[in-house]
C-alpha cells in the first residue's frame, strides 16, 4: 500500500545530508488561533477527555499534509478567550486567559531528489521544525509596565 | 463486517436545529476519522467536514462552518452530525462515510452509511 | 478550494463497449484521486483510488490511469449491472471536492 517512493539520493551525495536537512524556523499553523466566542461551546465539562475538562478548554483542528510525515497533525484551538470557572464550568474568569501552548515538532517532508546534471531521483526527506499548538493553558495576564 | 447506521428520515421546520447519529460496527471506531457527504437532489456530492473518534479532531469545508458540527461519542461508537439553523437549501440526503487509509498516500471512504434523508419545510 | 471537472456528463453506450470518463482538477493533484460508483437509489462505493488502485472486490474490468491534472477511469467491457453515476474525488487538500458525476446508460 505504501506509494511513497523510496528515497534514493543520488550516488556520491552524503546520504544523512541528502535526507535530512535541518530546518530551525518553525512553520507556523495554517491559521492564527482565534478563541471561539460562542458561549455555548465555552464550558469545562465535568467528564470525557481532558481538553473538554479544562478551565481553558479546547478542540482540535486537523492539518493534513500528504507530503510531510506525519501526515496528520492536530492543532489544538482555545474555545473560551478568558478561563472558565472551576465552581460553575460556564462563567469565564476575566482575571485569567486562555492561551495555546506550542510546541516544535520534528517533521519529515517528501521533496523530489535531484541528481547528477538535475535530473529527478526519486523522494528524499527533508527535516524541519513544525509549531504545533497542543493545548489551552488558563495563565495570568501579561501585566503591561 | 464494517457497518455504519444512521439514523432515519427527518423532516424539519425551517429554523430549527437536528441531529443525525452514525453508529459504527465492525471496528475500531478510534481507528478510523469518519467523514460527512452532503447529496442534494440525488445529484452532486459536497463534503461537508470529517473528525477523528480518537481526539475529537476536526476539519470542515469552510461552506458548512456554522451550519454543521462534527462530535463522537467514542462509548457507543458514534458519530455524530449536528445541522443548525436549517433552511430549504439543506434538504438533502446525508452520508457518513469512514476514511479508509494505509498509512501513507491513500485517503478514501471505504464504507458508506445508508444515508439520511433531511426535508426541510414548514 | 480544488475544482473537479468531469466529462462526460452523461453517456450512453451498448454492453460490451469500452468507456472512458475523465476527470480535470483545477490544480495538479498528484496521483490522489478516488473513484467513486452510485447505482440508482443506493449508496456512493469505492471503486478505485489513489488513481489506479482497485478496491477489494471491484471487477478487474474497471480501471483508472493518470498523474497531475488529467484522470481517466477506463470500463473494458460494459455489462448491465454497471449503469450508475461515477463520480471523481480528490483528496490532495482539504476540503475534500468531487466531480460533479458522469451517468453512465445502456444503450
Known amino acids: 500500500y505504501s506509494h511513497w517512493p523510496s528515497c534514493c539520493p543520488s550516488k556520491g551525495q552524503d546520504t544523512s545530508e541528502e535526507l535530512l536537512r535541518w530546518s530551525t524556523v518553525p512553520v507556523p499553523p495554517l491559521e492564527p488561533a482565534r478563541p471561539n466566542r460562542h458561549p455555548e461551546s465555552c464550558r469545562a465539562s465535568e467528564d470525557g477527555p481532558l481538553n473538554s475538562r479544562a478551565i481553558s478548554p479546547w478542540r482540535y483542528e486537523l492539518d493534513r499534509d500528504l507530503n510531510r510525515l506525519p501526515q496528520d497533525l492536530y492543532h489544538a484551538r482555545c474555545l473560551c478567550p478568558h478561563c472558565v470557572s472551576l465552581q460553575t464550568g460556564s462563567h469565564m474568569d476575566p482575571r485569567g486567559n486562555s492561551e495555546l501552548l506550542y510546541h516544535n515538532q520534528t517533521v519529515f517532508y517528501r521533496r523530489p531528489c535531484h541528481g547528477e546534471k538535475g535530473t529527478h531521483k526519486g523522494y528524499c526527506l527533508e527535516r524541519r521544525l513544525y509549531r504545533v499548538s497542543l493545548a489551552c493553558v488558563c495563565v495570568r495576564p501579561r501585566v503591561m509596565g | 463486517e464494517v457497518q455504519l447506521q444512521q439514523s432515519g428520515p427527518e423532516l424539519v421546520k425551517p429554523g430549527a436545529s437536528m441531529k443525525i447519529s452514525c453508529k459504527a460496527s465492525?471496528?475500531?471506531?478510534?481507528?478510523?476519522?469518519m467523514n460527512w457527504v452532503k447529496q442534494s437532489h440525488g445529484k452532486n456530492l459536497e463534503w461537508i467536514g470529517l473528525?477523528?473518534?480518537?481526539?475529537?479532531?476536526?476539519s470542515y469545508n469552510q461552506n458548512f462552518k456554522g451550519k454543521a458540527t462534527l462530535t463522537v461519542d467514542k462509548s457507543s461508537s458514534t458519530a455524530y452530525m449536528e445541522l443548525l439553523s436549517l433552511t430549504s437549501e439543506d434538504s438533502a440526503v446525508y452520508y457518513c462515510a469512514r476514511e479508509g487509509y494505509d498509512g501513507y498516500l491513500y485517503f478514501a471512504m471505504d464504507y458508506w452509511g445508508q444515508g439520511t434523508s433531511v426535508t426541510v419545510s414548514s | 478550494d480544488i475544482q473537479m471537472t468531469q466529462s462526460p456528463s452523461s453517456l450512453s453506450a451498448s454492453v460490451g463497449d469500452r468507456v472512458t470518463i475523465t476527470c480535470s482538477a483545477s490544480?495538479?493533484?498528484?496521483?490522489?484521486l478516488n473513484w467513486y460508483q452510485q447505482k440508482p437509489g443506493k449508496v456512493p462505493k469505492l471503486l478505485i483510488y489513489?488513481?489506479?488502485s482497485l478496491h477489494s472486490g471491484v471487477p478487474s474490468r474497471f480501471s483508472g490511469s493518470g498523474s497531475g491534472t488529467d484522470f481517466t477511469l477506463t470500463i473494458s467491457s460494459l455489462q448491465p449491472e454497471d449503469v450508475a453515476t461515477y463520480y471523481c474525488q480528490q483528496y490532495s487538500k482539504l476540503p475534500y471536492t468531487f466531480g460533479q458525476g458522469t451517468k453512465l446508460e445502456i444503450k
Open positions: 489513489y488513481t489506479s
Open positions: 465492525g471496528y475500531s471506531f478510534t481507528d478510523y476519522t
Open positions: 473528525i477523528n473518534p480518537y481526539n475529537g479532531g476536526t
Open positions: 490544480q495538479g493533484i498528484s496521483n490522489y
